[in-house]
Amino acid sequence: LCQGSNYSTCASCPSCPDRWMKYGNHCYYFSVEEKDWNSSLEFCLARDSHLLVITDNQEMSLLQVFLSEAFCWIGLRNNSGWRWEDGSPLNFSRISSNSFVQTCGAINKNGLQASSCEVPLHWVCKKCPFADQALF
């Protein structure tokens, strides 16, 4: 049942909850509403998921197909360097801050963007699929 860490690689499990999109071995939730970064993180955690942690350029390119010009929060923060919420460093793409308040990361169809964490944006959650959707 895709057990273990939220950040582990998922086995190929059957399905995703309603309103989640299955892509590869993961389920993705693209929000309709907007929240600040912390509230977005809480939303994902409350649903046994995490704010999107992108593992490589391939996953980033695939996800960007589903994005527009509007930025979405992802699980990326600048704490003495840009790191994903699983603790891994950002090493396959570039992001730069234009001011000291831009410590959270967002993505749109064109790439990554640093932003103040207070800005209300859409967000993307990522989780492992469930064998039984009733578990969600």
Partner: antibody, heavy 120, light 107 residues
Framework: EVQLVESGGGLVKPGGSLRLSCAAS????????MSWVRQAPGKGLEWVAT????????YYADSVKGRFTISRDNAKNTLYLQMSSLRAEDTAVYYC?????????????WGQGTLVTVSS | DIQMTQSPSSLSASVGDRVTITCRAS??????LAWYQQKPGKAPKFLIH???TLAEGVPSRFSGSGSGTDFTLTISSLQPEDFATYYC?????????FGQGTKLEIK
């Protein structure tokens, strides 16, 4: 169209207080950091204060720290600058300014300014 | 605090001239620099951010360059409406310091 309209300026005695307001329209006020920048007569621009989106974080120039308070009312789309213990050197045109978005803290939009004169 | 120093403080030029204004930071600010134009009795107008990115609606005759400590604003062919005072500004951190301004006058 982005519009920022300052008000509340005027003549005040040294040691006195004044509250400036900036009415914002044409954009979603609650998505942007806001700032005050001033310009003494015949002089250059000086950053005064900046406030975060929620109002939870405020930042001040050393020259006004402890005397000025920046605040905002997102429900009223209004930015404020409460000025106290005013000095002659605070005489200036005070501009309200909006950042570029996403916490890009350059001053992308400016109001027309309001003149504060501190004199006995 | 980071200090911003502009040169020259004033400059005379003619319509059609190419003009360059310099801004120097007291320490490395990478590309965290903005430029503004101000006409007498008016509010400043935002021209450039990140040292070289033109703000929306700014004519292409304006350009910015530089990184680190040395920056320039260039107007490739001066127009009558370009005569004004220009300011640079450090935009990454507190305090957001401005240069003292460069007054561009008609020769």
């Amino acid at each position: 169209e982005v519009q920022l309209v300052e008000s509340g300026g005027g003549l005040v005695k040294p040691g006195g207080s004044l509250r400036l307001s900036c009415a914002a329209s044409g954009f979603t006020f609650s998505r942007y950091y806001m700032s005050w920048v001033r310009q003494a007569p015949g002089k250059g621009l000086e950053w005064v204060a900046t406030i975060s989106i929620s109002g939870g974080q405020t930042y001040y120039a050393d020259s006004v720290k402890g005397r000025f308070t920046i605040s905002r009312d997102n429900a009223k789309n209004t930015l404020y600058l409460q000025m106290s213990s005013l000095r002659a050197e605070d005489t200036a045109v005070y501009y309200c300014a909006r950042e570029g978005g996403y916490g890009n803290l350059w001053f992308a939009y400016w109001g027309q300014g309001t003149l504060v004169t501190v004199s006995s | 605090d980071i200090q911003m120093t502009q040169s020259p403080s004033s400059l005379s030029a003619s319509v059609g001239d190419r003009v360059t204004i310099t801004c120097r930071a007291s320490e490395n600010i990478y590309s965290a620099l903005a430029w503004y134009q101000q006409k007498p009795g008016k509010a400043p107008k935002f021209l450039i951010h990140n040292a070289k990115t033109l703000a929306e609606g700014v004519p292409s005759r304006f350009s910015g360059s530089g990184s680190g400590t040395d920056f320039t604003l260039t107007i490739s062919s001066l127009q009558p409406e370009d005569f004004a005072t220009y300011y640079c500004q450090y935009h990454y951190g507190i305090p957001f310091t401005f240069g003292q301004g460069t007054k561009l006058e008609i020769k």
